[in-house]
């Protein structure tokens, strides 16, 4: 059964009372009745107004009291939600230096974790060159106090590579002129006999004319070291070698080079060119021991 | 070996055209400039035409400039020249030869011009 | 064009001599020569080239020497195969040019 039923029910039962008080005796007179009378009527009257007026006062007095109390509160929210919102701020502004601070911090710890890392990758390869060094002096001493007819490790300064040891020049020199400082350092102008001997020399030499030990000197194409042409790597660019004619400098071209991109070219042989120095090492010797 | 084989020489009137062929080998062909050089009876040696590798660069003697035309296929390892309006100084052995300094020459054939 | 003369046009010369024959360009070569030799009804043979470099297989009796514009052939001892023509070449430029040659003949 739902409220409002059982409300309008109990409104029926009231209205079936008041029929059955109408329908009894007569009822004795009411004390209203009685109290309205004359004098007495006029003494209550005053007294209700005299109550009424002290109730007026009284919650007159207790209205401006709670409207006072009311400002003081207003007053004293208006002085908190300022109050907070200062603290708020003041906490966001601080909250906000500690994250820049914390920003800072990271990227100060980040840059010195950096920092140890490439400290430390720098002393590994330090270390690494230290050990080279230190086989390689310790190579040169055993090649000193020995007769100097093998070779078993690289000069200083050379670098080694599949059980040869190359140079690279920084200046530049005529094809001959290379070719006999070469030799003068037991050695001879590069001899490129594969692709990964060519990506090699290619790698260090950069995109630079580089001489190399191979020539035909308007003979037949040889190199310096006797390897074999014919049968042998070649890596000339497209249309090369052409023994060109057009420069003027008389007669073609017969010393071959490194172009920029790696491939080779001829080209007159008195061009100063850098170049690369190649010696093999002693195939049956083995690196000694460091102590 | 390096081998320089000529053919395509023989009796041409003149005004004629001939073409002659070399075929190398035992050297690879297409790093070398070629030359033509041919030698009348009882003379000297002269040089006629000359072609870098690649084609690129060819030159002729003044005696066959706009008559000969030196051509090569790297592929078949071949050198040729062709000779148009043939007179009786053309008369001669040509050989081919390998390189600037003709480190190496063919046997040569003979073009002889005669009415 | 550049001229190449040679001398003397002709030679004779007997078995073991020492001989050197001579080219002249008319005007700088550098080292651009190269010398043949010709025997009688052959193709012509290649000694030398940049003045003094000697072709594989060719026998060191053989030298060359020279730069610029004069350059000689020298010939330690002579051999019965040796008696032929003798030409030089220049290849420093183009038209290439040769010499009107040598005749060593046996004395």
């Known amino acids: 059964m739902t409220k409002e039923y059982q409300d309008l029910q109990h409104l029926d039962n009231e209205e079936s009372d008041h029929h059955q008080l109408r329908k009894g005796p007569p009822p004795p007179q009411p004390l209203l009745q009685r109290l309205c009378s004359g004098p007495r009527l006029l003494l209550l009257s005053l007294g209700l107004s005299l109550l009424l007026l002290v109730v007026v006062c009284v919650i007159g007095s207790q209205n401006s009291q709670l409207q006072e109390e009311l400002r003081g509160l207003r007053e004293t929210f208006s002085n908190f939600t300022a109050s907070t919102e200062a603290q708020v701020k003041g906490l966001s502004t601080q909250g906000g230096n500690v994250g820049r601070k914390m920003k800072s911090l990271e990227s100060q710890l980040e840059k010195q974790q950096k920092d140890l890392s490439e400290d430390h990758s720098s002393l590994l390869l330090h270390v690494k060159q230290f050990v080279s060094d230190l086989r390689s002096l310790s190579c040169q001493m055993a090649a000193l106090q020995g007769n100097g007819s093998e070779r078993t490790c690289c000069p200083v300064n050379w670098v080694e590579h599949e059980r040869s040891c190359y140079w690279f020049s920084r200046s530049g020199k005529a094809w001959a002129d290379a070719d006999n400082y070469c030799r003068l350092e037991d050695a001879h102008l590069v001899v490129v006999t594969s692709w990964e001997e060519q990506k090699f020399v290619q790698h260090h030499i950069g995109p630079v004319n580089t001489w190399m030990g191979l020539h035909d000197q308007n003979g037949p194409w040889k190199w310096v070291d006797g390897t074999d042409y014919e049968t042998g790597f070649k890596n000339w660019r497209p249309e090369q070698p052409d023994d060109w004619y057009g420069h003027g400098l008389g007669g073609g071209e017969d010393c071959a080079h490194f172009t920029d991109d790696g491939r080779w070219n001829d080209d007159v042989c008195q061009r100063p060119y850098r170049w690369v120095c190649e010696t093999e090492l002693d195939k049956a010797s083995q690196e000694p021991p460091l102590l | 070996e390096v081998q320089l084989v000529e053919s395509g020489g023989g009796l041409v009137k003149p005004g004629g055209s001939l073409r002659l062929s070399c075929a190398a080998s035992?050297?690879?062909?297409?790093?070398?400039?070629m030359n033509w050089v041919r030698q009348a009876p009882g003379k000297g040696l002269e040089w006629v035409s000359s072609m870098s590798n690649s084609s690129s660069s060819i030159y002729y003697a003044d005696s066959v400039k706009g008559r000969f035309t030196i051509s090569r296929d790297n592929a078949k390892n071949s050198l040729y020249l062709q000779m148009n309006s043939l007179r009786a100084e053309d008369t001669a052995v040509y050989y081919c030869?390998?390189?600037?300094?003709?480190?190496?020459w063919g046997q040569g054939t003979l073009v002889t011009v005669s009415s | 064009d550049i001229q190449m003369t040679q001398s003397p046009s002709s030679l004779s010369a007997s078995i073991g001599d020492r001989i050197t024959l001579t080219c002249r360009a008319s005007q700088g070569i550098s080292n651009y020569l190269a010398w043949f030799q010709q025997r009688p009804g052959k193709a012509p043979k290649s000694l030398i080239y940049?003045?003094?470099s000697l072709l594989s297989g060719v026998p060191s009796k053989f030298s060359g020497s020279g730069s610029g514009t004069d350059f000689t052939l020298t010939i330690s001892s002579l051999q019965p195969e040796d008696f032929a023509t003798y030409y030089c070449?220049?290849?420093?430029?183009?038209?290439?040019?040769f010499g009107g040659g040598t005749k060593v003949e046996l004395k």
């Open positions: 940049a003045a003094s």
């Open positions: 070449q220049q290849y420093n430029s183009f038209p290439f040019t």
């Open positions: 035992g050297f690879t062909f297409s790093s070398y400039r």
């Open positions: 030869a390998r390189q600037a300094a003709q480190d190496y």
